[in-house]
Interface confidence: medium
């Protein structure tokens, strides 16, 4: 599923991401935009042999199990394919664990490079939330 911007903002808000660990909803929408272009089925492979999955591009070395990443920790205790569902519950629950891990949203390279320090509220402007 490819979400619309406001559609995703509403879904993320419903799942409790607005101001989760101090990160406003705009941060999460911005991260999703630059990680996956709002596509729940996005997958991208990394040079270390791991793969990033889903709308927030969650990594298989640390957070989920795809059955083929050497030394996977699976800290969210889920199959990576669950992160590709049109229902973003699994991605959101795992993202909450990631953002609580100490580095906050810096865990998402695209957020760090494209969203951090920018007017992230622009990502939810005009949305009925």
């Amino acid at each position: 599923k490819v979400f619309g911007r406001c559609e995703l903002a509403a879904a993320m808000k419903r799942h409790g991401l607005d101001n989760y660990r101090g990160y406003s909803l705009g941060n999460w929408v911005c991260a999703a935009k630059f990680e996956s272009n709002f596509n729940t089925q996005a997958t991208n492979r990394n040079t270390d042999g791991s793969t990033d999955y889903g709308i927030l591009q969650i990594n298989s070395r640390w957070w989920c199990n795809d059955g083929r990443t050497p030394g996977s920790r699976n800290l969210c205790n889920i199959p990576c394919s669950a992160l590709l569902s049109s229902d973003i519950t699994a991605s959101v629950n795992c993202a909450k664990k990631i953002v609580s891990d100490g580095n906050g949203m810096n865990a998402w390279v695209a957020w760090r490079n494209r969203c951090k320090g920018t007017d992230v509220q622009a990502w939810i402007r005009g949305c009925r939330l």
Partner: antibody
């Protein structure tokens, strides 16, 4: 136990297309990548690409882009590879395997012969 | 693409001999190298994963070593059932690639 069962041998004419199947049992089909590998005598083993059945995400070896197309049906736990515009170079044994980085589980292979 | 070169192409041995098969990568692949055995008209069978981890059910006479670009599969006291083709495969990057194989044959 994990098993991958491939469809039977095929004899096709040049220019035709063929669809090979790979039925998986003994594990959660949707959560593991299925890989496809080609073997020709004297050419060793070649990785064609992979599909994640749960999402339909696919990756192809550049060499096989336009030649191979992967699909999967999670209701029947079956992965498919279609090969198009067949030539004699496509005559080979084609294997599916469960993609764990390494390949512990393989299908028995499907022999494709392309001949006029 | 990472190229894997296996040597020798053919190895003629007598049962009871010990042998070493080589696989060399065109660039460093850490320990992301796996070994397979294949008999005629059969699918490949995983022997060793990640350079040195023997797969369950594989006899202890098979061992693997190496890291980076140079890898070795050793068979201590070859048995008649060990004859066939041996392939290495890398999972360090895409596309996955295989070596050209070493044929282990009876002298």
């Amino acid at each position: 136990q994990v098993q991958l069962q491939e469809s039977g041998a095929e004899v096709m004419k040049p220019g035709a297309s063929v669809k090979i199947s790979c039925k998986a049992t003994g594990y959660t089909f949707s959560t593991y990548w299925i890989e496809w590998v080609k073997q020709r005598p004297g050419h060793g083993l070649e990785w064609i690409g992979e599909i994640l059945p749960g999402s339909g995400s696919t990756y192809y070896n550049e060499k096989f882009k336009g030649k191979a197309t992967f699909t999967a049906d999670t209701s029947s736990n079956t992965a498919y590879m279609q090969l198009s515009s067949l030539t004699s170079e496509d005559s080979a044994v084609y294997y599916c395997a469960r993609g764990d980085g390494w390949y512990c589980y393989w299908g028995q292979g499907t022999t494709l012969t392309v001949s006029s | 693409d990472i190229e894997l070169t296996q040597s020798p192409a053919t190895l003629s041995v007598t049962p009871g001999d010990s042998v070493s098969l080589s696989c060399r990568a065109s660039q460093s692949i850490s320990n992301n190298l796996h070994w397979y055995q294949q008999k005629p008209h059969e699918s490949p069978r995983l022997l060793i994963k990640y350079a040195s981890q023997r797969e369950s059910g594989i006899p202890s006479r098979f061992s693997g070593s190496g890291s980076g670009t140079d890898f070795t599969l050793s068979i201590n006291s070859v048995e008649t059932e060990d004859f066939g083709m041996y392939f290495c495969q890398q999972s360090n990057s895409w596309p996955r690639t295989f070596g050209g194989g070493t044929k282990l044959e009876i002298k």
